[in-house]
């Protein structure tokens, strides 16, 4: 019953972070969450930071600056994969959840 | 010092295909993403495709995307563009260039290959 | 897709001439503006990225600047081996890479 429930976890975190992904930048709050996801967990987009890319509000070569390994302003504007993040949250958060709930 | 070839370019006629190649030498191909990019005779600058570090990320101009192809082997240090539908508009050098992203502009271009689509 | 519109398309000096070409961007791009300096039969080379920063190697007369929409590339005084085709280039929003039209500097 524990990992049913987990899974279930795990699928809810997947479609709410890829919901708040396609409100992104547009609505504050969900950018202001997103972005501290991001930055705390060292990760980016859902699956991979290739999830941004299907965000029509988000030129398809940008990132959330909160992607990039080292933090400045437009740093996500016409990223080189080398300098962000490519592991998606969903997986990096969920093995976060595991070990800590 | 670092070095961009293209090869593989020639005449081919309305409807052939094309495999073009770009060997580098000199830096760290993982570390950029790579263009081909075209100049017709007589004509500007075209951007025709480009591919991220890894290979992920692979976008087309309009005018040649479902034709062409672009892929990269990080192995053999290697970029290429396979052309299939070729028609006379594709008629240009095409040039292989390195793109280090961000503020940056594209800072080495091969010295380019000539394709000539004709019958 | 961000156009981008050079002027003047052509230009005659002469050698030792102050030289100012212009590169308009349809939208805003903020400084992500590239100029390439491009001799016949060769491939084009950077001379300028980020709108003002100079590409090592390229001789200091050779500067940029502008942000936002508009954009200038001067040569403070024209040297015989700057007679070229010179191009901008957005990398703002891609794809697609944008170029502009070119402009061709001549020999008066």
């Known amino acids: 019953a524990g990992y049913v429930f987990r899974d279930k976890v795990m699928s809810e975190f997947n479609n709410n972070f890829r919901q708040q992904m396609e409100n992104y930048p547009k609505n504050n709050h969900t950018a202001s969450i997103l972005d501290r996801m991001q930055a705390d967990f060292k990760c980016c987009g859902a699956a991979n930071y290739t999830d941004w890319e299907k965000i029509p509000s988000m030129s398809k070569n940008r990132v959330p600056d909160s992607c990039c390994i080292n933090v400045t302003v437009g740093c996500g504007i016409n990223f080189n994969e080398k300098a962000i993040h490519k592991e998606g949250c969903v997986e990096k958060i969920g093995g976060w959840l595991r070990k800590n709930v | 010092q670092v070095q961009l070839v293209e090869s593989g370019g020639g005449l081919v006629k309305p409807g052939g295909s094309l495999r073009l190649s770009c060997a580098t030498s000199?830096?760290?191909?993982?570390?950029?993403?790579m263009n081909w990019i075209r100049q017709a005779p007589g004509k500007g600058l075209e951007w025709v495709s480009y591919i991220s570090n890894s290979g992920s990320i692979r976008y087309y101009a309009d005018s040649v995307r479902g034709r062409f192809s672009i892929s990269r082997d990080n192995a053999k240090n290697s970029l290429y563009l396979q052309m299939s539908s070729l028609r006379a508009d594709d008629t240009a050098v095409y040039y292989c260039?390195?793109?280090?992203?961000?503020?940056?502009?594209?800072?080495?271009w091969g010295q380019g290959t000539t394709v000539t689509v004709s019958s | 897709d961000i156009q981008m519109t050079q002027s003047p398309s052509s230009l005659s000096a002469s050698v030792g001439d102050r030289v100012t070409i212009t590169c308009r961007a349809s939208?805003?791009?903020?400084?992500?503006l590239n100029w390439y300096q491009q001799k016949p039969g060769k491939a084009p080379k950077l001379l300028i990225y980020?709108?003002?920063s100079l590409q090592s190697g390229v001789p200091s007369r050779f500067s940029g600047s502008g942000s936002g929409t508009d954009f200038t590339l001067t040569i403070s005084s024209l040297q015989p081996e700057d007679f070229a085709t010179y191009y901008c280039?957005?990398?703002?929003?891609?794809?697609?890479?944008?170029f502009g039209q070119g402009t061709r500097l001549e020999i008066k």
């Open positions: 980020a709108a003002s």
């Open positions: 280039q957005q990398s703002y929003s891609t794809p697609p890479i944008t």
């Open positions: 939208q805003s791009i903020s400084s992500y």
């Open positions: 260039v390195r793109d280090p992203r961000q503020i940056y502009g594209m800072d080495v």
């Open positions: 000199g830096f760290t191909f993982t570390d950029y993403f």
